[in-house]
Amino acid sequence: GSERTCCPVNWVEHERSCYWFSRSGKAWADADNYCRLEDAHLVVVTSWEEQKFVQHHIGPVNTWMGLHDQNGPWKWVDGTDYETGFKNWRPEQPDDWYGHGLGGGEDCAHFTDDGRWNDDVCQRPYRWVCETELDKASQEPPLL
């Protein structure tokens, strides 16, 4: 098959996923496109353990994740259920703030300097994290 069995060069393996951490910024949609061309997606945080891992690698820098509400409800880019899933918003966030003067509200989620999440204008050029899952089939016994 085409499943990955090891992480690409310059990616970091953690808990059967591969992560790539940018060192420069792009708008959320452009970061999303970059990850997709890498056969990956913007990082989807599903646990406190994964949150701490990502936070450790990005440091105190605003960084996009794969969570947005551009079409209404909050959605993870890989289809992970938002309502029942892990969340780590800053107090009083998300607030869809309109006071920034850039037009519209705030529809894209990012890690803030303390790792907690905030919603912000999707056009801001923040760093980003791509994630791709390693072949889960290789971890399971073959079907008989």
Partner: antibody, heavy 121, light 107 residues
Framework: EVQLLESGGGLVQPGGSLRLSCTAS????????MSWVRQAPGKGLEWVSV????????FYADSVKGRLTISRDNSKNTLYLQMNSLRAEDTAVYYC??????????????WGQGTMVTVSS | DIQMTQSPSSLSASVGDRVTITCRSS??????LMWYQQKPGKAPKLLIY???SLQIGVPSEFSASGSGTDFTLTISSLQPEDFATYYC?????????FGPGTKVDIK
């Protein structure tokens, strides 16, 4: 040696179809996104389309959206460009190029020799 | 879409000359910029990526700089094989876009 070899160009009437191929050798084809870039006679470079290594993600220039389709067969190390509803302005040399991801940049580091597509009645 | 412009569109120079080509983007693209060289009848060749990093195998007479909207490609001492057309390309955003090119010919 890392190499890309295009084929399938030729003369076609307006409204006609053509399929370009690009065969890769010397590298792990499925690990790289691939792109098509074209150059009209005497003009500059125009990006046309890109496809991820698995083939699961594709993007197109607005000028070709709905008419040109990029695809790949990783078992054959081959990239394709299906060209339908061709127009005179599609006349160009078509290059396939390997896309590399470096420091968040998308660069084209390996190019084929190009194949000429002429749309004329 | 992000528009790329280049200046000059063409220039004449002699072997040994220092040549500078400018590329500008219609919006800030940070350092998501590449430079390519193309000779007549040949495919383009990647020279520079990430605005200032020299691609492997490219001679050290080529250098580049810039960030945001303004970028330059410099050939410190023009060699006979450097007479060609040079293109910049942005990869901040899809669609990827190229500049119109700068033709460097012999004076």
């Amino acid at each position: 040696e890392v190499q890309l070899l295009e084929s399938g160009g030729g003369l076609v009437q307006p409204g006609g179809s053509l399929r370009l191929s690009c065969t890769a050798s010397g590298f792990t084809f499925s690990s790289y996104a691939m792109s098509w870039v074209r150059q009209a006679p005497g003009k500059g470079l125009e990006w046309v389309s890109v496809i991820s290594g698995s083939g699961g993600t594709t993007f197109y220039a607005d000028s070709v959206k709905g008419r040109l389709t990029i695809s790949r067969d990783n078992s054959k190390n081959t990239l394709y460009l299906q060209m339908n509803s061709l127009r005179a302005e599609d006349t160009a040399v078509y290059y396939c190029a390997r896309r590399i991801a470096v420091a968040g940049n998308d660069a084209f580091d390996i190019w084929g020799q190009g194949t000429m597509v002429t749309v004329s009645s | 879409d992000i528009q790329m412009t280049q200046s000059p569109s063409s220039l004449s120079a002699s072997v040994g000359d220092r040549v500078t080509i400018t590329c500008r983007s219609s919006q800030s693209i940070s350092t998501y910029l590449m430079w390519y060289q193309q000779k007549p009848g040949k495919a383009p060749k990647l020279l520079i990526y990430a605005a200032s990093s020299l691609q492997i195998g490219v001679p050290s007479e080529f250098s580049a700089s810039g960030s945001g909207t303004d970028f330059t490609l410099t050939i410190s001492s023009l060699q006979p094989e450097d007479f060609a057309t040079y293109y910049c390309q942005q990869s901040y955003s899809i669609p990827f876009t190229f500049g119109p090119g700068t033709k460097v010919d012999i004076k």
